[in-house]
Amino acid sequence: AGYVFRDKVMSEFNNNFRQQMENYPKNNHTASILDRMQADFKCCGAANYTDWEKIPSMSKNRVPDSCCINVTVGCGINFNEKAIHKEGCVEKIGGWLRKNV
């Protein structure tokens, strides 16, 4: 039962994270939550940073600044892969959830 619950939590978190990405950066509250998660967990996007390319409000050469290894204003514009966290947040935060939930 514990594994089923854990998988459900992971699935819900994945769906929710992707849903929140769709609202970035239009919704300030959503943006600050996602930015906080990406910065704290050193991750970018749901599965990986390329998820941000699919967000209509984001230019294809852009990720949120919170994806950057060294976060500065505008660091996510015209980003270099070497300068951002490439691991996705669902897996990264999921690992933390598995340990702590």
Partner: antibody, heavy 119, light 108 residues
Framework: QVQLVESGGGLVKPRGSLRLSCAAS????????MNWIRQAPGKGLEWVSY????????YYADSVKGRFTISRDNAYNSLYLQMNSLRAEDTAVYYC????????????WGQGTTVTVSS | DIQMTQSPSSLSASVGDRVTITCRAS??????LNWYQQKPGKAPKLLIY???SLQSGVPSRFSGSGSGTDFTLTISSLQPEDFATYYC??????????FGQGTRLEIK
Amino acid sequence: QVQLVESGGGLVKPRGSLRLSCAASGFIFDDYFMNWIRQAPGKGLEWVSYISNSGNTKYYADSVKGRFTISRDNAYNSLYLQMNSLRAEDTAVYYCVRDPRSYYGMDVWGQGTTVTVSS
Amino acid sequence: DIQMTQSPSSLSASVGDRVTITCRASQSISSYLNWYQQKPGKAPKLLIYAASSLQSGVPSRFSGSGSGTDFTLTISSLQPEDFATYYCQQSYSTPPITFGQGTRLEIK
């Protein structure tokens, strides 16, 4: 020294194919995005395609989409452009260009290789 | 797509003149604007990046300014080797990477 050397250009018939290569030296190749930029005779600069450090992300100008394919081999410090279904309007000098990204500008350009599409 | 428009398209000037070339973006590009110089039969060369930063090895007579949509490249005192074609380019929103149509600087 930092260098990009293109090869593979030449004369090809319409609807033909050609593969351009670019050999990079003097820098850590996978630290950079790479571009192909072309210049038709007497015309300005036109971006053709770019590829990310790892090769995961590739984009193309609308004028070449579906006909050209960019790729890279980081183990061999090489960039490629496979050009299929060539048209007369693809006639140009093709430059291999290094791109550090962010706001730094495209800082290293090859000498260019000439592609002529004519029957 | 962001369009880049340069003016003038050609310009005649003399050695020692102060020359200004302008570049306008169709929407704000912050300071993500680069300038290149190209001589006949040669590859372009990066002169200015981030609107106003001089690329290493480029003479200090070249300078860039502007932010948002309007940018200028200034050559304070033209030298014989400066007669060439100049291009602006934006990297704020790509793809596509877009260039201005070029400004040809000729000897008067």
